[in-house]
């Protein structure tokens, strides 16, 4: 007996062939002899089974000898033994229908987890593969369990049947839905402007939700919230902000923030949550601002960076073109009695300059100028 | 949804041979028949012959037996036909099409956009 | 080969008029036939199948009749998007033909 394997929904042609290469009577029967359809001369005929408004055959073929049954929109009750009689003959196809669906909505928060649950026919004992976008592969039987979703288990999920040693594909796209960094780190002279950017990793066409901007200042004991706005449609609107500092934001996605000025009372870590419509859960994308203050004193040069700054950066400060003259791993430097000149304050991870603020220093009877 | 999505234009000269392909997405690409149709310029259409993805069984127009094959890749749901022993009036633009079948007969559903074949010397 | 004949191989119309086109087959096809649509440099789009249903999405304006050898699609009251050019085509048997066309202009 022939097996066939389909999948819930979508549409099987079973075939049948008879040895003679014209169109003669054929009918397809059920596992019960009732008849699903067959053929008057070159008519289609239907019999009183329950396929059948979805039961169909291709005339085109049958004057070749070949008299399909189409079924259409499959249900996993329709697996059964299907029966053709031509010729005197009975060919039998027995048809397995399974289904593979994601038993939450396919639109998970990062961190979630993701069921996938079989459908398959009484008697059947299949067994199930998925590979995910990044090339995971988790096997199961019934169902099929994720954890801790991650950003890159978004894309088409394959997953495939194996039963009777025939196999059945089926494709699942996934939205892992998650803002495209989990934290980034703006650094900032004192005074100028500071953009905040959160762009998310996934789009669809209606994005609904709240979300606010808490800030855990350096200086500051407690966390406070700067703003909290409402997202319908991917059009963004402010709903309170704080007097200080007075952040604005952009209309349209990405979720975009503008602080006036950088100060050091503003150095520190925010954290943006978004809770969108009909999820549980709530994405979230840390933010660190670090504030540069380069100041001379009478006779001190000194340079301060505020906020969450790693222990590996250094800071230093140097004459422009020469050495540096002091150069630590803290938060704090200082030159006494600097020479004049451009004095560049630096801070910088391996070499690389994350920040960088220029302070001249007048000769000794002048006072300093800062660009 | 579905989609059917064809290469792009060539232009052969005659004699020569041309392949189009045409991937499939949006539907089990092994579950309906694609179909080859052509237009010549300002001319209608023509019917070349069909091909059912999941046995790679295939149905040409006699006018077009000898001269046509079509085949299919499963693992990439990419249909292809190939036309040899190119003639003038083989230019035309070449359609695949899904069909749906209603009733036991074969109608075009689904197209793709179409792919310009030009044969000039 | 079954040949299917249109007429009037071209057609001017305005907006709002009704307009009737006919196809005939060189034999009979039973209600085995198709209507398409086709609007310069695209492909052609399904309208009506098994000579009078309307695929979904068409508007209901499109109409089609007929049996055995003589079938006519009607546009009930023509709209600037329907100004194109019309083929039947037969599945009754292969190879599947189509009509020369119907090429419907706006007057």
């Known amino acids: 007996k022939k097996v066939v394997l389909g999948k819930k929904g979508d549409t099987v042609e079973l075939t049948c062939t008879a040895s003679q290469k014209k169109s003669i009577q054929f009918h397809w029967k059920n596992s019960n002899q009732i008849k699903i359809l067959g053929n008057q001369g070159s008519f289609l005929t239907k019999g009183p089974s329950k396929l059948n408004d979805r039961a169909d055959s291709r005339r085109s073929l049958w004057d070749q000898g070949n008299f399909p049954l189409i079924i259409k929109n499959l249900k996993i009750e329709d697996s059964d033994t299907y029966i053709c009689e031509v010729e005197d003959q009975k060919e039998e196809v027995q048809l397995l229908v399974f289904g593979l669906t994601a038993n939450s909505d396919t639109h998970l928060l990062q961190g979630q987890s993701l069921t996938l649950t079989l459908e398959s026919p009484p008697g059947s004992s299949p067994s199930v593969q998925c590979r995910s976008p990044r090339g995971k592969n988790i096997q199961g039987g019934k169902t099929l369990s994720v954890s801790q979703l991650e950003l890159q288990d978004s894309g088409t999920w394959t997953c495939t049947v194996l039963q009777n040693q025939k196999k059945v594909e089926f494709k699942i796209d996934i939205v892992v839905l998650a803002f495209q960094k989990a934290s980034s780190i703006v650094y900032k002279k004192e005074g100028e402007q500071v953009e905040f950017s959160f762009p998310l990793a996934f789009t669809v066409e209606k994005l609904t939700g709240s979300g606010e901007l808490w800030w855990q200042a350096e200086r500051a004991s407690s966390s406070k919230s700067w703003i909290t706005f409402d997202l319908k449609n991917k059009e963004v609107s402010v709903k309170r902000v704080t007097q200080d500092p007075k952040l604005q934001m952009g209309k349209k996605l990405p979720l975009h923030l503008t602080l006036p000025q950088a100060l050091p009372q503003y150095a520190g870590s925010g954290n943006l949550t978004l809770a969108l419509e009909a999820k549980t859960g709530k994405l979230h994308q840390e933010v660190n601002l670090v504030v540069m203050r380069a100041t001379q004193l009478q006779k001190n040069l000194t340079c301060e960076v505020w906020g969450p700054t790693s222990p590996k950066l250094m800071l230093s400060l140097k004459l422009e073109n020469k050495e540096a003259k002091v150069s630590k791993r803290e938060k704090a430097v200082w030159v006494l009695n600097p020479e004049a000149g451009m004095w560049q304050c630096l801070l910088s991870d391996s070499g690389q300059v994350l920040l960088e603020s220029n302070i001249k220093v007048l000769p000794t009877w002048s006072t300093p100028v800062q660009p | 949804q579905v989609q059917l999505v064809q290469s792009g234009a060539e232009v052969k000269k005659p004699g020569a041979s041309v392949k189009v392909s045409c991937k499939a997405s949006?539907?089990?690409?092994?579950?309906?028949?694609i179909h080859w149709v052509r237009q010549a310029p300002g001319q209608g259409l023509e019917w070349m012959g069909w091909i059912n993805p999941n046995n790679g069984g295939t149905h040409y127009a006699q006018k077009f037996q000898g001269r046509v094959t079509m085949t299919r890749d499963t693992s990439t749901s990419t249909v292809y036909m190939e036309l040899s022993s190119l003639r003038s009036e083989d230019t035309a633009v070449y359609y695949c099409?899904?069909?749906?079948?209603?009733?036991?007969?074969?109608?075009?559903?689904?197209w793709g956009q179409g792919t310009l074949v030009t044969v000039s010397s | 080969d079954i040949q299917m004949t249109q007429s009037p191989s071209s057609l001017s119309a305005s907006v709002g008029d009704r307009v009737t086109i006919t196809c005939r087959a060189s034999?009979?096809?039973?209600?085995?036939l198709a209507w398409y649509q086709q609007k310069p440099g695209k492909a052609p789009k399904l309208l009506i199948y098994a000579a009078s249903t309307l695929q979904s999405g068409v508007p209901s304006r499109f109409s089609g009749s007929g049996s055995g050898t003589d079938f006519t699609l009607t546009i009930s009251s023509l709209q600037p998007e329907d100004f194109a050019t019309y083929y039947c085509?037969?599945?009754?048997?292969?190879?599947?033909?189509f009509g020369q066309g119907t090429r419907l202009e706006i007057k």
């Open positions: 099409a899904r069909d749906m079948v209603r009733d036991s007969a074969e109608y075009f559903q689904h």
């Open positions: 085509q037969q599945s009754h048997t292969i190879p599947w033909t």
């Open positions: 034999e009979d096809i039973s209600t085995y």
């Open positions: 949006g539907h089990t690409f092994t579950s309906y028949y």
